[in-house]
Interface confidence: medium
């Protein structure tokens, strides 16, 4: 059993593997294109210069929680925000952006690298810790949606069993390991 | 050395309400776990319900919607608010708290448990 999502201790929800933040609705389309015709009359940006689209890369650092355990020191991670559009052409408030061609193909800002980090989970009551490795986002990218993009693609990490720490006492009140197992996962 | 004193525990008929309340003393880190676990006669001990000094909570499926755990931080105390209480909830209820530093278990502590029945 994967996280499929992990919540933060504000109750934020992280994205698990193979998903990723789903910007708002946007009337954004793009140009420039081959296949589209190539750039469209007097259209002074280029919209392969990576510094005109303002997909931001927002960090968050917060612990990562999976039933009643929680990582024990928390994890940052990228979070992938913002129109994939030329920066000079984005409004100032809130509203929609018209672009020159209509139907053209939908570029959203995504994830485009992962990494993955291993992240050691505390469990309450006398549970044995555990460890998971996890993937999280490390870079952020305007890339053309495709109908796969609406289904998770990859899977998560299996959980992995931790090595017991060193000089670690037995507490009181401890259960055994099928105990403490059953109890998590009844917990869920 | 850190002691925990529960209360709030009796006898309750089904649909009832009881609160239970687990006060900390001692030396207590700031980054740390409370909760609540019950045992049943000739059960095993199982968590009802956990809540981390930053707020995060976590129930056990069989509470989730009638039992509401809280704490204050500053008077180092967890309650538990138990509503529309079954027969099957009697159990001995036991205050856990454990304490993390640097990343790891610094310590873990039960405390006594209180006992709540559910009888008509």
């Known amino acids: 059993q994967g996280w499929q999502a992990f919540r933060n201790d504000a109750t934020e929800v992280i994205p698990g593997l193979g998903e990723y933040p789903e910007p708002p609705p946007e009337n954004n389309q793009t140009m420039n294109r081959a296949e589209n015709g190539g750039r469209p009359p007097h259209h002074p940006y280029d919209a392969k210069d990576v510094s005109e689209y303002s997909c931001r890369e927002l960090h968050y650092t917060r612990f990562l929680t999976d039933g009643p355990c929680r990582s024990a020191k928390p994890v940052t991670e990228l979070v992938c925000s913002g129109q994939c559009g030329p920066a000079r052409l984005l409004p100032n408030a809130i509203g929609r952006v018209k672009w020159w061609r209509p139907n053209g193909p939908d570029f959203r800002c995504i994830p485009d690298r992962y990494r993955a980090q291993r992240v050691q989970l505390l469990c309450p009551g006398g549970a044995a810790p555990r460890s998971r490795k996890v993937r999280l986002v490390a870079s952020c990218k305007c890339k053309r949606l495709t109908r796969f993009h609406n289904q998770s693609e990859l899977k998560d990490f299996g959980p992995e069993t931790a090595r017991p720490q060193k000089g670690r006492k037995p507490r009181p009140g401890a259960r055994g390991a099928k105990a403490n197992q059953a109890e998590l996962e009844n917990a869920y | 050395e850190v002691q925990l004193v529960e209360s709030g525990g009796g006898l309750v008929q089904p649909g009832g309400s009881l609160r239970l309340s687990c006060a900390a003393s001692g030396s207590i880190f700031s980054d740390n776990v409370m909760g609540w676990y019950r045992q049943a006669p000739g059960k095993q001990r199982e968590l009802v319900a956990t809540?981390?000094?930053?707020?995060?909570?976590n129930y056990a499926d069989s509470v989730k919607g009638r039992f509401t755990i809280s704490r204050d931080n500053a008077k180092n105390t967890v309650y538990l608010q138990m509503n529309s209480l079954k027969p099957e909830d009697t159990a001995v209820y036991y205050c856990n708290l454990g304490t993390i530093v640097t990343g790891t278990w610094r310590s873990d502590y039960w405390g006594q448990g209180t006992q709540v029945t559910v009888s008509s």
């Open positions: 809540i981390w000094s930053s707020g995060h909570t």
